[in-house]
Interface confidence: low
């Protein structure tokens, strides 16, 4: 049996005004409204769950709904990445796989899927109310990215029912190319509807959902075009931390990595695009769309942005064994 | 259950088009991959490419680019294959294949289609 | 393009045989090496993906092994109806290839 904890991402709102409006005041907010619920803002959902046979081994399953090239997907522990989490794995359509102890195996379920099985013990294992993010970095929307973590009070024996807790950050400069003609009316609708004082601003409510089609909707359209323009933004804390973290592949053999288009998903290349780049100083690699930077066998410290990648000389799966161990 | 089911076999002339067909069934079709084989009369399997049928973007092997097409009808689980300008060495059986699991990179056709095969011939 | 040599090209063996097709990648591929069949008139059906990874409705006695660049398909006691074509095929970067296939005949 398992313990279970799902994390939907926040859904555009559906029109539900009540109440009337002069028809006059109502043709463009109605029009706006439109072009905001159909937008097609993409979602994030989490599901973490904790085997009750193994009460150390989490398996964290991560899904991107939207209609873009996902080009790389974060997995990090203890907050989301860049706000104070730990990376575990780096998924690149292309370039492959990576991940860090305590991840015993990451990998892609379907094409806008992944999972990620974590087990340890001591310092570095994993307890009861970690937050676990997934970012996913996609073409054109950006970057979005949503967290989860199992209800403290989670016993494994019992299977918990998924309990939606929306955590979402948009890296607006991904989706700012045509959405923001979209965003602009958004704030033109939101400055329509707050002067209509007399209606009442019902709270948003995440409906429970599966991770087939988690969704969480915005009844309150005032509230919803708020969340378009500034996406809330929370961290759970924990009083769990995780352990600094080793690489989970110190086998021999260079490491070494390309440089990589930002939307590279969008235009899928082969091998040929960085197989004949130079092979850095052995052991070495530079990580990910956040900027993660690490020497082997120490912990990517967080710098700047900048999309690099860089995948082992020997595929993309060769940090990945039969159980993503080496 | 899982199925694969495509076209049947074609016969062309040299310069003509030609429109494979494949379609799925007992299963979410934009939860996979598509990917294409190629097999010489008597001859082993060549990989062709595939196609990303949540996203739509195809990406085509070196031997396969210029005169190849992959494309989609989501809406009724359809992949297709098309050759434009048909050469008397594209006289082979051609295969669909789903992947699994997905990444660019992909690796296991774990269903495959019953094959179609394109007789090209003046 | 990474190359996979298959052999024997073809082995002949009589029913109730084990035996074991081999697999050689002129480079590196680590596990993501996959072995499928296929009959006369047939499409392939795949066996073992991952070098040794079973496949569910694959009977047992295949067993795939190996690793990097030199691996194995072993077929335990065959039966009738494993006669055909084996080919492996290298996922481990594009394009993807298949080796040129070994033929397992009945002796």
């Known amino acids: 049996m398992r313990t279970e904890a799902q994390v939907p991402a926040l859904q555009p709102p559906e029109p539900g005004l009540e109440g009337a409006m002069g028809h006059r005041t109502l043709v463009l907010p109605w029009v706006l409204l439109t072009l905001c619920v159909t937008a097609g803002t993409p979602e994030v959902w989490v599901q973490v769950r904790m085997e009750a046979t193994e009460l150390s081994s989490f398996t964290i399953r991560c899904g991107f709904l939207g209609s873009g090239s996902i080009s790389l997907v974060t997995v990090s522990w203890g907050g989301p990445n860049g706000a104070g989490g730990t990376t575990l794995a780096v998924l690149h359509p292309e370039r492959g796989i990576r991940q860090w102890a305590p991840a015993r195996q990451a990998r892609w379920e379907t094409q806008s899927s992944i999972s990620l099985i974590l087990e340890g013990s001591g310092a570095s294992s994993p307890c009861a109310n970690t937050t676990f993010c997934c970012k996913f970095a996609s073409f054109p929307e950006g970057s979005w990215e949503a967290c989860g973590s199992l209800p403290p009070s989670s016993d494994p024996g019992l299977s918990a029912p998924p309990t939606p807790a929306p955590i979402l950050r948009a890296d607006l400069a991904g989706i700012l190319g045509v959405s923001g003609v979209l965003l602009f009316g958004c704030v033109y609708l939101l400055h329509l509807l707050r002067r209509h004082k007399h209606r009442p601003a019902p709270r948003l409510q995440p409906s429970r959902t599966s991770p087939q089609a988690p969704r969480a909707r915005a009844w309150a359209p005032s509230q919803a075009s708020q969340a378009a323009l500034h996406v809330p933004y929370a961290t759970i804390n924990t009083s769990c931390r995780p352990a600094t973290l080793d690489t989970a592949h110190p086998h021999g053999g260079p490491s070494w990595w390309a440089s990589l288009p930002t939307h590279a998903a969008h235009r899928p290349q082969g091998p040929a695009a960085w197989a004949s780049t130079p092979i850095p100083a052995r052991g070495s690699f530079v990580s990910v769309e956040n900027g993660l930077y690490a020497q082997a066998g120490e912990r990517p410290p967080h710098t700047g942005p900048g999309l690099t990648l860089f995948p082992d000389p020997r595929g993309p799966r060769a940090m990945e064994g039969p159980l993503g161990v080496r | 259950q899982i199925q694969l089911v495509q076209s049947g076999p074609e016969l062309k002339k040299p310069g003509e088009t030609v429109k494979i067909s494949c379609k799925a069934s007992g299963y979410t079709f934009t939860t996979y991959g598509m990917s294409w084989v190629k097999q010489a009369p008597g001859k082993g399997l060549k990989w062709m490419g595939w196609?990303?049928?949540?996203?739509?973007?195809?990406t085509y092997a070196d031997d396969f680019k210029g005169r190849f097409a992959f494309s989609l009808e989501t809406s009724a689980s359809n992949a297709y294959l098309q050759i434009n300008n048909l050469k008397n060495e594209d006289t082979a059986t051609y295969f669909c294949?789903?992947?699994?699991?997905?990444?660019?990179?992909?690796?296991?056709?774990?269903?495959w289609g019953q094959g179609t095969t394109l007789t090209v011939s003046s | 393009d990474i190359v996979l040599i298959q052999s024997p090209a073809t082995l002949s063996v009589t029913p109730g045989d084990s035996v074991s097709l081999s697999c050689r990648a002129s480079q590196f591929i680590s596990n993501n090496l996959h072995w499928y069949q296929q009959k006369s008139h047939e499409s392939p059906r795949l066996l073992i993906k991952y070098a040794s990874q079973s496949i569910s409705g694959i009977p047992s006695r295949f067993s795939g092994g190996g690793s990097g660049t030199d691996f194995t398909l072993t077929v335990n006691s065959v039966e009738t109806e494993d006669f055909g074509m084996y080919f492996c095929?290298?996922?481990?970067?594009?394009?993807?290839?298949f080796g040129g296939g070994t033929k397992l005949e009945i002796k």
């Open positions: 095929q290298q996922s481990n970067s594009w394009p993807h290839t």
């Open positions: 196609i990303n049928t949540y996203s739509g973007v195809p």
């Open positions: 294949a789903r992947e699994l699991p997905f990444t660019t990179i992909i690796g296991t056709k774990d269903y």
